[in-house]
């Protein structure tokens, strides 16, 4: 299945964080979502063939990339309290 690391993370405001997602073998598309109690599930961005194909309405502090082996990373710089959330990754063909 899809593997995300780390499972849990505690950071202080102003720090940066990098989350990793390994898709199902053979899947070329990886999408990232942010889930919060207040806003529900919000789309961050989608990568396909190592390229960002779509992006949601998030500030430039949120960025990502996809490596040649399809693994993806998302990065949040200068963390704010409102960034506390569950970050989900999904993969597809």
């Amino acid at each position: 299945g899809v593997t995300q690391t780390p499972r849990y993370l505690i950071k202080t405001r102003g720090q940066q964080v990098t989350l990793s997602c390994s898709p199902i073998s053979g899947h070329r598309s990886v999408s990232w979502y942010q889930q919060t109690p207040g806003q529900g599930l919000q789309f961050l961005f989608e990568y396909f063939s190592e390229t960002q194909r779509n992006k949601g309405n998030f500030p430039g502090r949120f960025s990502g990339r996809q490596f040649s082996n399809s693994r993806s990373e998302m990065n949040v710089s200068t963390l704010e309290l409102g960034d506390s959330a569950l970050y989900l990754c999904a993969s597809s063909l």
């Epitope: 990568y47 190592e50 390229t51 960002q52 990339r65 996809q66 490596f67 040649s68 082996n69 990373e73």
Partner: antibody, heavy 118, light 106 residues
Framework: EVQLQQSGPVLVKPGASVRMSCKAS????????IHWVKQSHGRSLEWVGY????????GYNQKFKAKATLTVDKSSSTAYMDLRSLTSEDSAVYYC???????????WGQGTTLTVSS | EIVLTQSPAITAASLGQKVTITCSAS?????MHWYQQKSGTSPKPWIY???KLASGVPARFSGSGSGTSYSLTISSMEAEDAAIYYC?????????FGAGTKLELK
């Protein structure tokens, strides 16, 4: 330090073929796609295509599909571009560039100058 | 194919002058990137993802825009800024560059 070292200038006759190389160092070669870009004399940049060094998958600008073939040698961390049926229109500087994994080129080679002349 | 139109094609600025280069896309794009190229050298990443400065780029440079209209601005022209600037976008599966803007020192 990330570096993309390209092969030297080439002079060939019309109708010939040529291979140019791009040797990567300073990072894991199979992590990032390598793209090729053409710059004709005094003109803008044209995207030729890319290769995924991890699995060999390629993508081409339709304009160059019959002209260019992209390959890699993982053991030497080197990407290659073969150009065939050369004409004077193919005379240009060709750059290899590393794709950042999202939407732009974060490192470029120094370029290979190709001159096609009889 | 998304066509990128840069304007002006050539411009000259005096030291300390504010400079703005624009890049217009034929269809909406998510991101625009800018490269600087000086004579006889390879392009360098200059501004990426619309407004992020690449490593080593002076703070007098900035980028902005959305949809089909993007710009690169130099708040105060310096001699070392004289170069050609190219915009670039990637709309899968085709990547395109603008024709370039040549910035000269007046």
């Amino acid at each position: 330090e990330v570096q993309l070292q390209q092969s030297g200038p080439v002079l060939v006759k019309p109708g010939a073929s040529v291979r140019m190389s791009c040797k990567a160092s300073g990072y894991t070669f199979t992590d990032y796609n390598i793209h090729w870009v053409k710059q004709s004399h005094g003109r803008s940049l044209e995207w030729v295509g890319y290769i995924n060094p991890y699995n060999g998958r390629t993508g081409y600008n339709q304009k160059f599909k019959a002209k260019a073939t992209l390959t890699v040698d993982k053991s030497s961390s080197t990407a290659y571009m073969d150009l065939r049926s050369l004409t004077s229109e193919d005379s240009a500087v060709y750059y290899c560039a590393r794709w950042d994994g999202s939407s732009y080129f974060d490192y470029w080679g120094q370029g290979t100058t190709l001159t096609v002349s009889s | 194919e998304i066509v990128l139109t840069q304007s002006p094609a050539i411009t000259a600025a005096s030291l300390g002058q504010k400079v703005t280069i624009t890049c217009s896309a034929s269809s909406s794009v998510s991101y625009m990137h800018w490269y600087q190229q000086k004579s006889g050298t390879s392009p360098k990443p200059w501004i990426y993802e619309i407004s992020k400065l690449a490593s080593g780029v002076p703070a007098r440079f900035s980028g902005s825009g959305s949809g089909t209209s993007y710009s690169l601005t130099i708040s105060s022209m310096e001699a070392e800024d004289a170069a050609i600037y190219y915009c670039q976008q990637w709309n899968y599966p085709l990547l395109t560059f603008g024709a370039g803007t040549k910035l000269e020192l007046k």
